[in-house]
Interface confidence: low
Amino acid sequence: QETELSVSAELVPTSSWNISSELNKDSYLTLDEPMNNITTSLGQTAELHCKVSGNPPPTIRWFKNDAPVVQEPRRLSFRSTIYGSRLRIRNLDTTDTGYFQCVATNGKEVVSSTGVLF
């Protein structure tokens, strides 16, 4: 299944972002690489990578099936990386499958990418 890529994804709650039409000339936001799809087995560990860059440094949010991903101690976590953000899910369960989306904003622009865990 192909990775879905959108700069104005429907999954971004409209009230979450107030995007200025007057962009600062020095600011930019780029999706460097589409998110990877993952096929794995129960009990294994999966990682999804959101590769973005920008100025000012972007803030990245994770969604699963349109809901904010909430970290679960010792099982589900996300953290900043030099390339953006990494979402890791340990001890995979059938309920972990779905569409995972990262949404990055620098306060003026938004980019997003969606990957599938199945």
Epitope: P13, S16, N65, D66, A67, P68, V70
Partner: antibody, heavy 114, light 107 residues
């Protein structure tokens, strides 16, 4: 436009159950989580849990484990929250709220009194 | 569970005042924080997402700052319609937890 319309006020006796409905319009119910939040009179907000109407998955605040049930009827774009074994301290306004807490229902007052 | 505390619990201010409300988390929540405004008898309304991002339709006099454990909501010039109770919410870990609220009333 997006709207969440909740059922009317309820008065229940201790030990009974209450089921509150939340009808969604203006968006697709099945692709947005629905949170339930309650607020006791004069008190703060308390997250109860969510349901993902697309598949019926739920996540609850452990405080309510075993007492709360969240369901949905996608044919009428409605989510439900049922709270059982009611106590007087369950008297509160119960709200539904969409995925990112961007839209809320008007609230349903549930009064538990003998 | 992550505990959220807010200060002050209440404050009195005048129209035009600069108002600052703080929210503190018992552990690092990154910037997984939402600020809400609630008026009596009404549902909460989201103001700020992800600690610093203004929600659509919210006046620019509202701003959010902070990350980790310490967060601030600032109203740069208080307007009559801003008298209300303000809550923070962390969505870093389950269960999601709200702060106890800060009531802003007229001096």
């Amino acid at each position: 436009q997006v709207q969440l319309v909740q059922s009317g006020a309820e008065v229940k006796k201790p030990g009974a159950s209450v089921k509150v409905s939340c009808k969604a319009s203006g968006y697709t119910l099945t692709t947005n989580y629905m949170h339930w939040v309650r607020q006791a009179p004069g008190q703060g907000l308390e997250w109860m849990g969510w349901i993902y109407p697309g598949n019926g998955n739920t996540k609850f605040n452990h405080k309510f484990d075993g007492r709360v049930t969240m369901t949905r009827d996608t044919s009428i774009s409605t989510a439900y929250m049922e709270l059982s074994r009611l106590r007087s301290d369950d008297t509160a306004v119960y709200y539904c709220a969409r995925s990112d807490f961007d839209y809320w229902g008007q609230g349903t007052l549930v009064t538990v009194s003998s | 569970d992550i505990q959220m505390t807010q200060s002050p619990s209440s404050l009195s201010a005048s129209v035009g005042d600069r108002v600052t409300i703080t929210c503190q988390a018992s552990q690092d929540i990154g910037n997984n924080l939402i600020w809400f405004q609630q008026k009596p008898g009404k549902a909460p309304k989201s103001l700020i997402y992800f600690a610093t991002s203004l929600a659509n339709g919210v006046p620019s006099r509202f701003s959010g700052s902070g990350s980790g454990t310490d967060f601030t909501l600032t109203i740069s010039s208080l307007q009559p319609e801003d008298f209300a109770t303000y809550y923070c919410l962390q969505y870093r870990e389950y269960p999601l937890t709200f702060g106890p609220g800060t009531k802003v009333d007229i001096k």
